[in-house]
Interface confidence: low
């Protein structure tokens, strides 16, 4: 349905408030270093222009594409060359190359200051003084730090952010009311950003087919009563939504997501019995709720898969007629029967099935050739099961912090070339799999753990891609999306690594560590642990544990001392000397 003016169409569909918010997000995700005020000015100019197009769709420039309009606006920024360097060269290109160029310059790790949370009273005053600016600032700060954040979902976060301040700024104890809500939003926001980053990586690095396969598996687990044709329709629509958002087409994405939520709710009888509550909510809550909805119950008496996919004499005929449809049906049928499997495992099984059919359908006796294909699945299923069992046992034995430390050591030995901040961030997140998933019963552990690990390893992949330092990381990240986790699991100690020179400065600490939060103090200690392993990759667990225990005791002792700084200086020298002796540095 072509519209004379795309910008007028989206403005009318989304409404002024959502239109302005989405344009702000889009601009902040592209120009991550620009000041807030500059972005607000650009957004206001675009909004005024959109209103003229709503009044008269034939007005000058109203027929231009959104990429053209937004790109032209971004290219008016005076300091583009000074602030962004070669990104300014994008402005010399025509659409669609210009937008592709902007996309390629999105920075997953922008050099921006850490967001420091002001005092509660200061935040409440700012909220009351100018609520609109306060909320726009939130959108801007999140969007520029997370350039792939799922824009319609960020609107939902902003709505909850506003609700938290509206409620808590009138409470008797503002801090007790507000701070836990802000912590929850921060943690959920980071998780949401990372999940969306994997979707975009899947689309951009491995193509639409890979994303669709993921979506078939996930939606079939979630909606096992839905027919294959229904799941296929949802997958097609969902792929369009995420392709748009990952491509910077945020207005189209938000509009299409709303349409998809509407369709799902109008057809919930043929999709899932779990959607009723979601569908009674307002739009933003509804879309979020649908995305998180629990798996529906599996239909009773589903027949054995073997009949259609192994025993049937028509397997090769059906496969040859429409390969992707047949494989899609296999994935749908397998996934709806296995909510206990991770999506990546289901995709590995589908890949094994595809490889077998490719080989066997060209053989003299195809049926005999693929007759045992399901036997090949068993080891693929057992590998993640065993890995999760072992790691959950380790987590229960050690607790989260020490489990993170075990992973820090493991991953630093595998890929010691990776930067220390990246190793700390990724290993801390890998370690969170314990508290997130090990509490679940067996039937929910694998989908929780392995699909979460896929998200975290994607963080490693996108951070490493910006500054590649390890061929092993590049290989695990690029060769197969679904085998990333097994690939990293299989990496042994990197024997080619030349240990880092010892630098006492790395292990020099000051009294400021005493005022840090527990989390920040852990990060300091974990940073030191990574550096230790980089200096002495052959150090044993026992040696590292002894040094870390000494380090913890040193910090505790000096933080209790009267003259903290002197204690850190003198005791620190002793600790470094003792550590060097213990590790043979």
């Amino acid at each position: 349905d072509a519209h004379k003016s795309e910008v007028a169409h989206r403005f009318k569909d989304l409404g002024e408030e959502n239109f302005k918010a989405l344009v702000l997000i889009a601009f902040a995700q592209y120009l991550q270093q620009c000041p807030f005020e500059d972005h607000v000015k650009l957004v206001n100019e675009v909004t005024e222009f959109a209103k003229t197009c709503v009044a008269d769709e034939s007005a000058e420039n109203c027929d231009k594409s959104l990429h053209t309009l937004f790109g032209d606006k971004l290219c008016t920024v005076a300091t583009l060359r000074e602030t962004y360097g070669e990104m300014a060269d994008c402005c010399a290109k025509q659409e669609p190359e210009r937008n592709e160029c902007f996309l390629q310059h999105k920075d997953d790790n922008p050099n921006l200051p850490r967001l420091v949370r002001p005092e509660v009273d200061v935040m409440c005053t700012a909220f009351h003084d100018n609520e609109e600016t306060f909320l726009k600032k939130y959108l801007y700060e999140i969007a520029r730090r997370h350039p792939y954040f799922y824009a319609p979902e960020l609107l939902f976060f902003a709505k909850r952010y506003k609700a938290a301040f509206t409620e808590c700024c009138q409470a008797a104890d503002k801090a007790a009311c507000l701070l836990p809500k802000l912590d929850e939003l921060r943690d959920e926001g980071k998780a949401s950003s990372a999940k969306q980053r994997l979707k975009c990586a899947s689309l951009q690095k491995f193509g639409e087919r890979a994303f669709k396969a993921w979506a078939v598996a996930r939606l079939s687990q979630r909606f096992p009563k839905a027919e294959f044709a229904e799941v296929s329709k949802l997958v097609t629509d969902l792929t369009k939504v995420h392709t748009e958002c990952c491509h910077g087409d945020l207005l189209e994405c938000a509009d299409d997501r709303a349409d998809l939520a509407k369709y799902i709710c109008e057809n919930q009888d043929s999709i899932s019995s779990k959607l009723k509550e979601c569908c009674e909510k307002p739009l933003l809550e509804k879309s979020h709720c649908i995305a998180e909805v629990e798996n529906d119950e599996m239909p009773a008496d589903l027949p054995s898969l073997a009949a259609d996919f192994v025993e049937s004499k028509d397997v090769c005929k059906n496969y040859a007629e429409a390969k992707d449809v047949f494989l899609g049906m296999f994935l749908y049928e397998y996934a709806r029967r296995h909510p206990d499997y991770s999506v990546v495992l289901l995709l590995r099984l589908a890949k094994t099935y595809e490889t077998t059919l490719e080989k066997c359908c060209a053989a003299a006796d195809p049926h005999e050739c693929y007759a045992k294909v399901f036997d090949e699945f068993k080891p693929l299923v057992e590998e993640p099961q065993n890995l999760i069992k072992q790691n959950c046992e380790l987590f229960e034995q050690l607790g989260e912090y020490k489990f993170q430390n075990a992973l820090l050591v493991r991953y630093t030995k595998k890929v010691p070339q990776v930067s220390t901040p990246t190793l700390v961030e990724v290993s801390r997140n890998l370690g969170k799999v314990g508290s997130k998933c090990c509490k679940h019963p067996e039937a929910k552990r694998m989908p929780c753990a392995e699909d979460y690990l896929s998200v975290v390893l994607n963080q490693l992949c996108v951070l490493h891609e910006k500054t590649p330092v390890s061929d092993r990381v590049t290989k695990c990240c690029t060769e197969s999306l679904v085998n990333r986790r097994p690939c990293f699991s299989a990496l042994e100690v990197d024997e080619t690594y030349v240990p880092k020179e010892f630098n006492a400065e790395t292990f020099t600490f000051h009294a400021d560590i005493c005022t840090l939060s527990e989390k920040e103090r852990q990060i300091k200690k974990q940073t030191a642990l990574v550096e230790l392993v980089k200096h002495k990759p052959k150090a044993t667990k026992e040696q590292l544990k002894a040094v870390m225990d000494d380090f913890a005791a040193f910090v505790e002792k000096c933080c209790k001392a009267d003259d903290k700084e002197t204690c850190f200086a003198e005791e620190g020298k002793k600790l470094v000397a003792a550590s060097q002796a213990a590790l043979g540095l």
Partner: nanobody
Framework: QVQLVESGGGLVQPGGSLRLSCSAS????????MGWYRQAPGKQRELVAS???????HYADTVKGRFTISRDNSKNTLYLQMNSLEPEDTAVYYC?????????WGQGTQVTVSS
């Protein structure tokens, strides 16, 4: 690219034993599955035993209790210890290694069980 070379096959009497080896070279990191398959004359290739990266093993029902799969990471070698061999075990035995780069097969080694 991964190169696989099997050895240890031969002629053995029923009830006898053999130990197959599969030596891997090339880009062998990132392995997540290693297995032994066999193909008897006029039949399709079938899985005999497999071992995952964490050391868990899986055996075909016909060889359970008689065959043992193992690996030596330091030598990049996969083994199949075959005891109480039966004439039905006669086949060409192939070693298979899967890593992130793909699925790799050896050329096969002939095992003949006959009196």
């Amino acid at each position: 690219q991964v190169q696989l070379v099997e050895s240890g096959g031969g002629l053995v009497q029923p009830g006898g034993s053999l130990r197959l080896s599969c030596s891997a070279s090339g880009s062998i990191w990132g392995i997540y599955h290693m297995g032994w398959y066999r193909q008897a004359p006029g039949k399709q290739r079938e899985l005999v035993a497999s071992i995952t990266v964490d050391g868990s093993t899986h055996y075909a029902d016909t060889v359970k209790g008689r065959f043992t799969i193992s690996r030596d990471n330091s030598k990049n070698t996969l083994y199949l210890q075959m005891n109480s061999l039966e004439p039905e075990d006669t086949a060409v035995y192939y070693c298979d290694i899967r890593n992130v780069g793909g699925d790799y097969w050896g050329q096969g080694t002939q095992v003949t069980v006959s009196s």
